[in-house]
Structure formats: C-alpha cells, structure tokens
Interface confidence: low
C-alpha cells in the first residue's frame, strides 16, 4: 500500500508520457490523476514502466473502479493485464471481441494462465454461446481451447462454429467431448460430397456411432489406423470383418500391429476366427469355429 503524500510542485502529470518513467512510486501515486490514466491507458503500453511502477498504476485504477474496470479501459490495458489477478478479472464485463483479442495478444507465446482462463470464461459466459468468430479467435491463440470445455459447455457450440475447427484443435479431446461435437459436425458438413465430407468429419469420428461407421464403410474412405484407434470401442465392436476391411481399405494391414490394443483387441475377440483368417493378417483370438455366440447385452436388456 502506497502512502498518500502531496505531489511536489510542478510534478503534477498533465498527460501520460515518457517523463513519468523518472517518477518514484510515491510520486506516481501522488501526481498521476486516476481519471487521466483511465482516459490515456493506450499510452501506457508504449512507455517502459518498471513492474513496480505498473503496480502503482494498477492500484490507481483499482481505486477509481472498485467494482471492476469499464471495457474502454480494459481494451487498452496492454501489459498491465499481466498484473491482474483472476479475482480482478471476475469483476469485468468484456463483450467486445476486439478487447478479447487485444488481451490475448499480450499473453501470446505464454502458456494459458489463470488470468486468461478467467477472461475467456467471462467473455464466453457474457456472449451466451461460442459463436464462430469467438471460436476462431480462441483456437488461433490456444489450439487446445475446445478440448478444455466440459461436454455441457460444448453443447452451446452452434454447428456453424464447427467449420472453424482444425484437426489439431481436437487433439486433447476425450470421448465424452467428441460425443457432443460429432453430431454438430455431422450437421455442419451434411451437404458435402463423400470424399470431402470424410476429410472434414475424420477428426470428430471418436464420437461416431456404429451406424455411421457402417455407412462410411460403404464409401471407400480408406480410414487410417490412427483414426480407427480413436473410435469408440462400443461403436467398433458390432462391425463385421468385411465392414472393417472396407472402412480401412489398404490400411487394413495395420490391424496386425494394433491387435493387442483397444479397440482392435476387443473387436477381434468378437469376430469368428474364420472371418479374421480371410484378412490374411494372422490375427488371433477370434471365436473358434463351431462356437455359438450369445448376445448377452440383449438378454440383459430384456431381463
């Protein structure tokens, strides 16, 4: 806390300029009017203040706006944003995408911080949903942003926003998130032709149900093994050997290398060994010839 001291004669700041870098902390406190600072915040960034001096400037703004800064000030915070705590940011009402971009730019190249996370939360909650422009902005700065949202939060993403999503944006998504995103992607890309559709939908297929995988197997898509390994196990299990062969096309040979890993391992256990042998890959572990396969899940559902 800086003590209140009178401003020395002739030192009262008329504007925010470079002369202030020679002011001691107490002089900044005493000689810079908070209202002047608020109206000339855009100049602060161009002046090489020390961290200690920035602390004083923040303190002045905090006193002027105890309920939270107005957006006109927030937009021009620049490096002063790095001095804000999540508690400070929770008081803000940020509605302009330009403000969000300006602050994200300050943090560019750094890891996502609690301050930025709080800022984004405040912004998205204020908007009510993740529109395409917001999603474009956030994923440009933080490719992992989409996968940081809970399934409940993702449900507010409109299908139109899905066009902004790049494959790398989904790298850290887990199955529950893809369950929410996949139907939106299906809707967003529904008017595309076969091969173009597959290119777009491929990253979302970790949320696809069996029926959709069966449909894809009829379209010569040649799914790669990396995509296949990310499919839901429960969606893969009902696929026949012929369907998997069609789905993977020339990549079917890759099943051998993955035979001990899910979902391939569990799928093998559900297939007749005779059918697996038709692939000529030496896959082992299928149901031996002459064994009867009971669908216990159907029995459980009836009981």
């Amino acid at each position: 806390e800086v003590e209140k001291t009178a401003c020395p004669s002739g030192k009262k700041a008329r504007e925010i300029d470079e002369s202030l870098i020679f002011y001691k902390k107490w002089e900044l406190e005493a000689c810079v009017d908070a209202a002047l600072l608020a109206t000339q915040m855009d100049r602060v960034n161009a002046i090489p203040f020390t961290y200690e001096q920035l602390d004083v400037l923040k303190h002045k703004l905090d006193e002027l706006y105890p309920q939270g800064y107005p957006e006109s000030v927030i937009q021009h915070l620049g490096y002063l944003f790095l001095k804000m705590s999540p508690e400070d940011i929770r008081k803000w009402n940020v509605t302009s995408l330009e403000t969000l971009k300006a602050l994200l730019e300050v943090n560019k190249g750094h890891e996502m911080s609690p301050q930025v996370a709080t800022l984004i939360d405040r912004f998205v909650k204020g908007r009510g949903q993740l529109d395409k422009d917001t999603l474009d902005t956030l994923t440009a700065f933080y490719p992992g942003y989409l996968c940081s949202l809970s399934p409940e939060e993702l449900s507010s993403v409109p299908p139109s926003s899905i066009w902004a999503v790049r494959p790398q944006d989904l790298d850290t998504c887990d199955p529950r998130q893809l369950d929410v995103l996949y139907p939106k992607a299906r809707l967003a890309f529904q008017n595309m032709n076969g091969s173009e559709y597959f290119v777009k939908i491929q990253s979302f297929l970790g949320g696809a149900p069996t029926e959709d995988l069966k449909a894809l197997s009829q379209q010569n898509v040649s799914m790669d093994l990396a995509t296949f390994m990310k499919l839901r196990t429960d969606a893969v299990l009902p696929l026949t050997v012929a369907e998997v062969q069609k789905l993977l096309g020339p990549h079917v040979e890759g099943l051998k290398a993955e035979e001990r890993h899910r979902p391939v391992r569990d799928w093998i256990l559900r297939q007749r060994q005779d059918d697996l042998d038709t692939l000529g890959l030496g896959l082992q572990g299928g149901i031996p010839n002459g064994y009867l396969v009971l669908d216990l899940s159907m029995q459980e559902a009836l009981s």
Partner: nanobody, 125 residues
Framework: QVRLVESGGGSVQAGGSLRVSCLVS????????VGWFRQAPGKEREGVAA????????YYADSVKGRFTIAQDYAKNMVYLQMNSLKPEDTAMYYC??????????????????WGQGTQVTVSS
C-alpha cells in the same frame, strides 16, 4: 498421450510431514483439475485434494482439511500435495489424477480420466 508421474512419498513418523509431487504432461493445463487420491490396502480409493488450474481453487476431503495443502506450479506443470501432521491412517498409495474437461472440480473419482502409477506413503506410530 496424457501422462501423470508422481514422485516423493516415503516413510515418516506420526506427526511428521511429507510432500508428494505430480508432473502433468499434455493436459490442457488451464482448464484442468488435478487431484490427489489415496488407497489403503483393502479400502476404496478416496479423494484427498484437488486444484482447478483455471483459477487455483482448491478442494479438500474433510479428513485432511487443515493438514494437507495442494498447490500448483504453472511454469513447471507440477502439482504438489504438502502433508503435515501425518497420522497412521494416512498410510496409503497416493495417486495423482487429472482431467482436461472441467469447468470446476471435485473429489469424485469417476470425473478423473487420467491416472498416475501411484507413490507409497507410510506413516508409523
């Protein structure tokens, strides 16, 4: 692949202190919960403490409140559990767990998708 690696642990006398650490790789660190769970022989795995990295909010089980402190070091991707005033009943395997899809945290085991291998903590009387 997301990995969580615990370190620390060991043996200590009742009333002593220990710190266990968790290195978190490839979590979406800024919206994740990282929690510490423990499992004593023959008992269910229970939640001990969790931290939400988005805001630094912390959560504790009643049995450890005031004795254990969870903290994060953002730059190093580390989460620490400082355990003071240890009791024999704190003896257990301690596991670090994480999830990248939360908007808040808790100590419900099913909410955590990623788990470490565990580190043993033994408190003798």
């Amino acid at each position: 692949q997301v990995r969580l690696v615990e370190s620390g642990g060991g043996s200590v006398q009742a009333g002593g202190s220990l710190r266990v650490s968790c290195l978190v790789s490839k979590l979406t660190a800024w919206r994740s919960c990282v929690g510490w769970f423990r499992q004593a022989p023959g008992k269910e795995r229970e939640g001990v403490a969790a931290i939400y990295s988005g805001t630094g909010s912390t959560y504790y089980a009643d049995s450890v409140k005031g004795r254990f402190t969870i903290a994060q070091d953002y730059a190093k991707n580390m989460v620490y559990l400082q355990m003071n005033s240890l009791k024999p009943e704190d003896t257990a395997m301690y596991y670090c767990a994480g999830t990248s899809i939360r908007s808040s945290c808790g100590l419900v085991r099913d909410e955590y998708a990623y788990w470490g291998q565990g580190t043993q903590v033994t408190v003798s009387s």
